[in-house]
Structures are given as C-alpha cells and as structure tokens.
Amino acid sequence: PEPPTACREKQYLINSQCCSLCQPGQKLVSDCTEFTETECLPCGESEFLDTWNRETHCHQHKYCDPNLGLRVQQKGTSETDTICTCEEGWHCTSEACESCVLHRSCSPGFGVKQIATGVSDTICEPCPVGFFSNVSSAFEKCHPWTSCETKDLVVQQAGTNKTDVVCGPQDRLRA
C-alpha cells in the first residue's frame, strides 16, 4: 500500500508512517515503527502537557512567585498548568496573572462601585449629590448625607462630596 500523506486525528506522520500521539499528561519517548507502538511517558513532578502531543519534554508548571504577590489558586496536574492568583489586597496585572499590584483606593469624594477581586481592580465612582466619602478606601461606598430633619435638627453646614452635612439645633423664636 501507498505510504500515507495524512493521518487520523490523534496521530502524526513520521517516516511515511502514522503514529499515535501521546495523550495529555504524557510526553514522547520514541516514535512508532512498523513493529512497535509510540512510546510515551507521564510528565514528572511540576510538569504538564495539556494536549495530545509528540513533545519530547513536558512544560514546567507556572511558579506563583510570592515576591510578586502571587499565590496558588489551583495546583497543576500532569495535564493542567498551575493557576496563580494574587494575595489578599492585590490583583493581577494581566489575564495571564504574571504579577500583582495593590488594589486602588478610592479618594475622598469617590466611593467604591465594585470591590476588587484577585483579577480585577477596584472600580470607583464620584459621590453624587446627597452622598459623600471623606476617606481614601478600597472598600467604602459613598455614604448618604445625614438627614438633619429626622433628628429634629437643621442643616448648619451643607454637605459636599467629601464631607457630611453639619446639623445643629433649630433657632428658637424669642417671645
């Protein structure tokens, strides 16, 4: 029969012969021959291959470097890479999560719209009229101004986006 020019799925062509690829988690030790099958070997410690392959070396698991603020979110296996995430208070600088930066704080006049996660930064929003934030924080939302009326008090000093209203006693009319 004619030597093949193309092979089935999960096979590869070598020396005019179709050989089985190694399954995920295993590397190639030797190609098949007319008389023998492909020889594969499982990846070793801290190594992986995540596809059917003919690689002679497995890939190293990603290292979650604590000096870059990283920690292991999911330990790798022979078929999967390690997944890193950031330490508490930090978030990834990219989708690959190769390093971390400190969560941004929202300045006075701004509140937290969305608290940061391991993969996304804090989202801030300006405090609208009727709300304020007087601290720089990665957690605090804008707080509503105090309602003087409900305390039987009057506004002595108007609030801003950074300060609360100042309430005071009602002026009593002298008889």
Partner: antibody
C-alpha cells in the same frame, strides 16, 4: 488467546542470582510494553520493572534499581528479568504482565507467576 | 514511597453496592488520571478491572465503576455477587522515582 508463561523461579541464597523468563503468545509481542510485578507471600502487589515495546526504554522500582535488569527478545516473544544480589526481601511470586497497549503502568494480562525464594 | 491507602476489608450482601476507597497524595492519585484497579482471587493472578480512573477493559462487567476526587480514587461494585469476593488493589503512577505504586489491598467479603 493471550498467554504469558513465567519460568526460572526457585530457591536461591542471599547474594545469588536468578534469571526469570516470560514466554508470550496470542498477541503481537513487540506492540506492547511489558512489566514484572511481584507479590510477597500473603502481601500486596509491588511493581518491579517495565520495558517499552522496543526494549530500548526500561524502568525500575527503587527497591531493585542497580540489581535487576529487564530485557526482551521480540524475535522470541520473550521477556526476561535478570536478578542479581538477591535479598530475603525479594522473596515473592513474580508475575509477568502485559502493558495495556503502550502504557506499561496498566497491566491487562498476567501470567500465573513463578515463586522466587531467597533463603540460606 | 509508601503505598496508597485502602481499607483492609469491606463487606456487603448480594445485590448491594459497595465502594472501596484508595487515598494517595498530590504526587500520585492527585496528579495523574493513571489509576487502575485489580481483582485477585486466592491463588490466582490479578485481573485488570478499571484503568485511567474510570475506563473498563472489554469483558469487565459494567457493575464495576471507578471515579476520582482530589487525591482519593474509588471503586464501586453494584449488584454485589458471590463471585466478587476477592482482594482488590488500586494502583497509580507517581512522580517519585518508583514510578508505580499499589494500595495495600482490600478484602471484599460477600455476606
């Protein structure tokens, strides 16, 4: 029908040598990885050694590394285990086992075993 | 490398289901989907029942099934029969230089 027949076991003194053979039939011998697995009397199973279909790649358990040698002769459909510097703890039934296709860490057919006794 | 941990014995009545656990580490069961199970009747050679965690070789009854969660593999036998009474061994590839390790074995008694 797949058949594996071990031979070569027996009584040997500590420090002595033995060569086990496993005659295979009923399948294309060179297409399968092969292993030796042993079982001490009344104990569990222990993987000993394996070889790929070509015989080029060989693998050993730490407990036998440097003392045992696995080999195969594909023209004779035979697997071998040369055992040197034998110790009392090597006493066991030695099984020849066929690897499931090229995966020598699965054993889909086993021989009936040959008993190796290491004693003075 | 120490053996995988299996219960020494389990028992069940005919028709029941039983599960045998096999606990390893992140270096063996947890790292590889290369777990197999063997049945051994007294005085006989072992027989492959499950490979690659949950695959059954042809000729093995579908009453036998395998699974894995984290570092523990399990063999479940449903519709227990008298002929299932035997020793069962789990096995896994390992990152250690020993390559392959077995569990200590579980004696299954059908009451």
């Amino acid at each position: 029908e797949v058949q594996l027949l071990e031979s070569g076991g027996g009584l040997v003194q500590p420090g002595g040598s033995l060569r086990l053979s496993c005659a295979a039939s009923g399948f294309t011998f060179s297409r399968n990885a092969m292993s030796w697995v042993r079982q001490a009397p009344g104990k569990g199973l222990e993987w000993v050694s394996a070889t790929g279909g070509s015989g080029i790649s060989t693998y050993y358990a730490d407990s036998v590394k440097g003392r045992f040698t696995i080999s195969r002769d594909n023209s004779k459909n035979t697997l071998y285990l040369q055992m040197n510097s034998l110790r009392a703890e090597d006493t066991a039934v030695y099984y020849c086992a066929r690897g499931y296709s090229n995966s020598w860490w699965y054993f889909d057919y086993w021989g009936q075993g040959t008993l190796v006794t290491v004693s003075s | 490398q120490s053996a995988l941990t299996q219960p020494a014995s389990v028992s069940g009545s005919p028709g029941q289901s039983i599960t045998i656990s096999c606990t390893g580490t992140s270096s063996d069961v947890g790292n590889y989907n290369l777990v197999s199970w063997y049945q051994q009747h007294p005085g006989k050679a072992p027989k492959l029942m499950i490979f690659e965690v949950n695959q059954r070789p042809s000729g093995v009854s579908n009453r036998f099934s395998g699974s894995k969660s984290g570092t523990t593999a399990s063999l479940t036998i449903s519709g227990l029969q008298a002929a299932d009474e035997a020793d069962y061994f789990c096995c896994s590839y390992t990152t250690s230089s020993t390559y392959v390790i077995f569990g200590g074995g579980t004696k299954l008694t059908v009451l």
